[in-house]
Interface confidence: low
């Protein structure tokens, strides 16, 4: 917003106008207009000779503007010479600009037909358990005037959840400076926002337009079970589709899968609607949509629709999801060499083959750098020649390996360590 | 939008669930929930033993998730062990999750009371001189169904100038698939935008909600005088202020200053409203606002309001805006030295003092680097010793310099040049 008092010089012609005289024979004026303005209107420099006499001044296009800068990139400078015979120290010239045709617009305003009542102020919310009282005030001028009385007015309260648009907001009308919103108006555990405007009551002698909206007020509705799906709505397109939507908290939707179920009559079987489309709704909710086919609206005019957790199942086949218990491992010394021996927990089914993975390493190495061997259905493994006077570690794991059976490796057995003997010097 | 078919696994518990068995005595399951979900709802792992028997599985908190990654930053891993005596190659376990309380919502939809008619399609604009015809179509399903008939519907057309908000848009109702907008609806030389939605007609047996809005259509209204102020509106607050606003093309406002003038009755004197507030309105227009005081609405119930060019004047006093004609300059040689002499155009008023500014320079210098002298009421100046065999230039300008008189320097005189004589060598 910019403010200008009546009389403020603001046009480019007036801003740029400069007039100098030689105090003998003439006045020279320079000013500028803009190319953009000239497309729409031409203005003429006017000299007021006295209270009644306005004289147009003839001006030519000019190449420069030596006396003032033009505040616009596409200025059109002009220069005008006004012959003048007499100069007195008290002389003042009055210059203005006049458009090349009458410009303006006019309106006759009958006050009773052009009323915009004052906007509600001090909009506040107070709570009484699960009811919410909106109150506001409206300034009707001095009480003695009585031109606009409370009976001329009504109030339009619109309210919505924070995440919804005003276009879809609900409306309440009130003929007092308050309105009550109860559980029938509000969804639980939601943040609401409301605003109010003043309207002229239908029976009033006055007409015009509503006030501006009041500033908004926010509040949290009555607490409720936030895990429940909310705002289930269904609308029939009049042809063949019943479109339903509902909302779920994002955190709940991450743990519980909801479906839309419907019956075209109370005694029909329940069916699940598919596909479900999802969209984010603010930061807290997800809105879900699904379209139910309506093959015969004339026969089945009432649908029972529900949102329920879906029994979404995971099917896990035992024989391909086996993880055996880890083997138990021992280390034995056979003469100069070492062997690893292990046992698996007895399985009820002896036809299932086992694959073993054996790792052994020096104490100074990591399992990542260990030696790894894979054996089929074996329960022992002779180790190759090892370094003397060294601590070693070994571990083993098992998995099933027969066609038709699968799974993942068992956990590793408990790791076993042993020290190899020192070698006697040969002297 | 995301799409999910009924049955798609989408919850985090189901995504993360992995179960492995030792094919002998037990099944071990691991899964995760989120801290955020737990605040609102707890879910339990359920094993379906057969078609009718669902068994909850007891699970403990776990420190890790070795079998799957959790797609959420705040996961809570769990581990469950299910004893199991018998394993067969055809065994399949069915696992699901169940919330800790009944969740869901239910709606009985009577189709006739939950109708949202289809949105208008193919919205188009055509022109006939200064009238504009909006046409559209609406799909009502197969003709033989007759469930929703054209008589059940009406259309809400809203239209506005591009720069206005939909909240302030005008509304037209139509019971056919077209609407005509004429000069009485549209301001000239403006770009308009319209949209349409389908509503249930007041006399219909059906209820519900309007359709979505159609896509928008744009057009340019009939041409007009774009320099004219437009959209003058005034509204009385019912107390003491008549608020008026009007719009002007930005280019016009840069050259013509408009004011708001008012009379509280036809025979009252016209007054100008102040202050005027301005705001941008799109890229082409400026909206102006002013508030007219209404001291006595009961007595003066009709105001005549007009927007007109203001005679914004610039007052220019002759005696302080003098620019004399440039002097005429000559150079004379007096013996070995040079003098500058000048004359000013004869002024009618001899009592006005003159100040002269004289500049002289060598041919090789610029005026910026010249010697400058200032003299009062003089008409000549002797030059100091100059370099021999050198071309010099001089110029002079004049301004008034008496108390009560002011102005700006004249233009420079025509510059004069001369060559100094060479000096004979002394031998």
């Amino acid at each position: 917003w910019e403010r200008s008092l009546a009389g403020a010089e603001e046009t480019i012609p007036l801003q740029t106008l400069r007039c100098y005289n030689d105090y003998t024979s003439h006045i020279t004026c320079r000013w500028a207009d803009t190319q953009d303005a000239q497309r729409l209107v031409n203005v003429t420099l006017i000299r007021r000779v006295n209270e009644d006499l306005l004289e147009p001044v003839s001006c030519d296009l000019s190449d420069d503007m030596p006396w003032s800068a033009c505040p616009h990139p596409r200025c059109v400078p002009r220069r005008c010479v006004i012959p003048c015979q007499s100069f007195v120290v008290t002389d003042v010239d009055y210059f203005s600009f006049q458009p090349d045709r009458p410009l303006g617009t006019r309106l006759t305003v009958t006050l009773t037909q052009h009323v915009q009542p004052p906007e509600p102020r001090d909009l506040q919310i107070s709570t009484d358990q699960d009811h919410f009282l909106l109150t506001w005030s409206v300034a009707l001028g001095s009480p003695q005037s009585h031109w606009l009385s409370p009976g001329d007015l009504e109030f339009e309260v619109v309210y919505k959840r924070l995440q919804d648009s005003w276009e879809d907001a609900a409306i309440l009308l009130s003929n007092t400076s308050q309105a009550t919103l109860g559980p029938e108006h509000l969804m639980p555990s939601s943040t609401y926002v409301a605003r109010v405007r003043t309207r002229l009551a239908p029976g009033s002698r006055l007409s015009g337009r509503p006030s501006k909206w009041s500033p908004e007020v926010c509040w949290d509705s009555q607490p409720g079970d936030e895990a429940q799906p909310q705002n289930l709505e269904c609308f029939f397109d009049g042809a063949a589709v019943l479109s339903c939507s509902w909302e779920v908290r994002k955190e709940v939707a991450s743990s519980v899968s909801f479906g839309l179920f419907y019956k075209p009559s109370p005694d029909a079987g329940e069916e699940e609607c598919s596909p479900v489309l999802r969209e984010g709704l603010g930061s807290l909710h997800t809105r879900h949509h699904c379209q139910i086919p309506v093959p015969d609206p004339a026969t089945h005019g009432q649908y029972i629709v529900s949102v329920q957790p879906r029994r979404a199942e995971k099917h896990i086949k035992s024989s391909v999801n086996i993880q055996m218990a880890p083997p138990s491992l021992n280390v034995t010394k056979d003469g100069d060499s070492y062997s690893l021996r292990w046992e698996t927990m007895k399985m009820r089914y002896e036809h299932i083959d086992h694959t073993f993975e054996i790792q052994y390493r020096k104490d100074t190495a990591t399992w990542k750098d260990s030696k790894t061997e894979t054996l089929q259905n074996a329960h022992s493994m002779a180790l190759p020649a090892l370094e003397p006077s060294t601590r070693y570690w070994a571990r083993v794991r098992v998995r099933t390996s027969r066609t038709g059976y699968n799974g993942i490796w068992s956990e590793w057995s408990e790791a076993r360590s042993w020290d190899t003997e020192s070698v006697l010097p040969m002297w | 939008w995301e799409r999910s078919l009924a049955g798609a696994e989408e919850t985090i518990p189901l995504q993360t669930l992995r179960c492995y068995n030792d094919y002998t005595s037990h099944i071990t399951c691991r899964w995760a929930d989120t801290q955020d979900a737990q605040r609102l709802v707890n879910v339990t792992l359920i094993r379906r033993v057969n078609e009718d028997l669902l068994e909850p599985v007891s699970c403990d908190l776990s420190d890790d998730m070795p079998w799957s990654a959790c797609p959420h930053p705040r996961c809570v891993p769990r581990r469950c062990v299910i004893p199991c005596q018998s394993f067969v190659v055809t065994d399949v376990d069915y696992f699901s999750f169940q919330p800790d309380r009944p969740l869901g919502t239910r709606l009985t939809v009577t189709l006739t009371q939950h109708v949202q008619p289809p949105e208008p399609r193919d919205l188009q604009i055509s022109t006939d001189q200064d009238h504009f015809l909006l046409t559209w179509s609406v799909a009502l399903g197969s003709p033989q169904s007759h469930w929703l008939s054209p008589g059940d519907l009406e259309f809400e057309v809203v239209y506005k100038r591009l720069q206005d908000s939909w909240e302030d848009a005008a509304i037209l109702l139509s019971n056919t698939s077209q609407a005509t907008l004429g000069p009485e609806h549209l301001m000239p030389s403006s770009t308009y935008v319209a949209r349409v939605r389908t509503r249930l007609a007041p006399g219909s047996r059906l209820s519900g909600r309007p359709s979505k809005w159609s896509p928008e259509v744009c057009w340019d209204s009939q041409p007009g005088d774009e320099a004219q102020p437009q959209n003058l509106e005034c509204f009385f607050d019912g107390a003491a202020v008549l608020s008026c606003s009007w719009e002007v093309r930005k280019e016009v406002a840069s050259s013509v200053s408009f004011g708001l003038f008012y009379k509280p009755s036809p025979d009252a004197g016209e007054e100008e409203c102040s202050p005027v507030l301005r705001e941008g309105l799109g890229s082409l227009h400026t909206r102006h606002h002013c508030q007219i005081p209404v001291p006595d609405p009961a007595t003066h119930g009709q105001y005549i309001v007009s927007v007109q060019p203001r005679r914004a004047e610039k007052h220019i006093k002759s005696s302080v805006n003098i620019q004399m004609a440039p002097p005429s300059l000559n150079v004379t040689k007096d013996g070995d030295s040079y003098s500058l002499r000048w004359e000013t155009m004869k002024m009618r008023y001899e009592h006005i003092d003159h100040t002269f500014e004289i500049q002289y320079r060598k041919d090789t210098a610029t005026w910026k680097d010249s010697k400058t002298e200032t003299l009062q009421n003089a008409h000549s100046m002797a030059l100091p010793a100059l370099e021999p065999s050198t071309r010099y230039w001089a110029r002079v300008r004049v301004r008034t310099s008496r108390t009560g008189y002011n102005g700006i320097w004249s233009e420079w005189s025509e510059a004069r040049s001369w060559d100094t004589e060479s000096v004979l060598p002394m031998w």
């Epitope: 908004e216 007020v217 | 202050p275 508030q291």
Partner: antibody
């Protein structure tokens, strides 16, 4: 030049009274909503009182209600604040401020005076 | 009453740096919030009104944003004359209230 100049501050004992003046020049004070805002030494700003351009609307902060009175003299183009029953916590620089929106009454302040200091001390 | 909390209390920055000042309302004030600058010994000066509109004559380096309860004043590149105390003010509800101020000082 458009400006506001406050005067009338000074040292006063608890329970005492003062009348602060604010003289406007360069604009018509009665065309604007006018306000008093104060600032205790080294502290932030506190709104005190407002008078709408129509004069029919006057507002006060709870802390001064019943003790302070805002008024104006159209002929003198001046705004006043009569302050009675002064307390130590009323010690502050008192600024006169013009509303940004003229008779639209916007409740933001675009033109301020330099302030006048009121000290309440025994 | 609506309480406006400004943070930080003090911001130490060098000329040319970007300054971000915060103002939080105890309840929604929609976009009805202004920012002022005050230098020692001087009256406040209106910078921004209605959360994001620059007042007349205010340089483009000052910008405001936010609505509801959280608002920000940004000075894109600090000039020496920008070191001052900044206050926010709401007009959503009576009484009109100001924040406690943020002092922007030279580092």
């Amino acid at each position: 030049e458009v400006q506001l100049v406050e005067s009338g501050g000074g040292l006063v004992k608890p329970g005492g009274s003062l009348r602060l003046s604010c003289e406007a020049s360069g604009f018509t004070l009665s065309s604007y909503t006018m306000n008093w805002v104060r600032q205790a030494p080294g502290k932030g700003l506190e709104w005190v009182s407002s008078i709408r351009s129509s004069s029919s609307f006057i507002y006060y902060a709870d802390s001064v209600k019943g003790r302070f009175t805002i008024s104006r003299d159209i002929a003198k183009n001046s705004l006043y604040l009569q302050i009675n029953s002064l307390r130590a916590e009323d010690t502050a620089v008192y600024y006169c401020a013009r509303d940004y929106y003229g008779s639209g009454s916007y409740w933001y302040f675009d033109l301020w005076g330099r302030g006048t200091l009121v000290t309440v001390s025994s | 009453e609506i309480v406006l909390t400004q943070s930080p209390a003090t911001l130490s920055l060098s000329p040319g740096e970007r300054a971000t000042l915060s103002c939080r309302a105890s309840q929604s004030v929609s976009s009805y919030l202004a920012w002022y600058q005050q230098k020692p010994g001087q009256a406040p000066r209106l910078l921004i009104y209605d959360a994001s509109n620059r007042a007349t004559g205010i340089p483009a380096r000052f910008s405001g944003s936010g609505s509801g309860t959280d608002f920000t004043l940004t000075i894109s590149s600090l000039e020496p004359e920008d070191f001052a105390v900044y206050y926010c003010q709401q007009r959503s509800n009576w009484p009109l209230t100001f924040g406690g101020g943020t002092k922007v000082e030279i580092k």
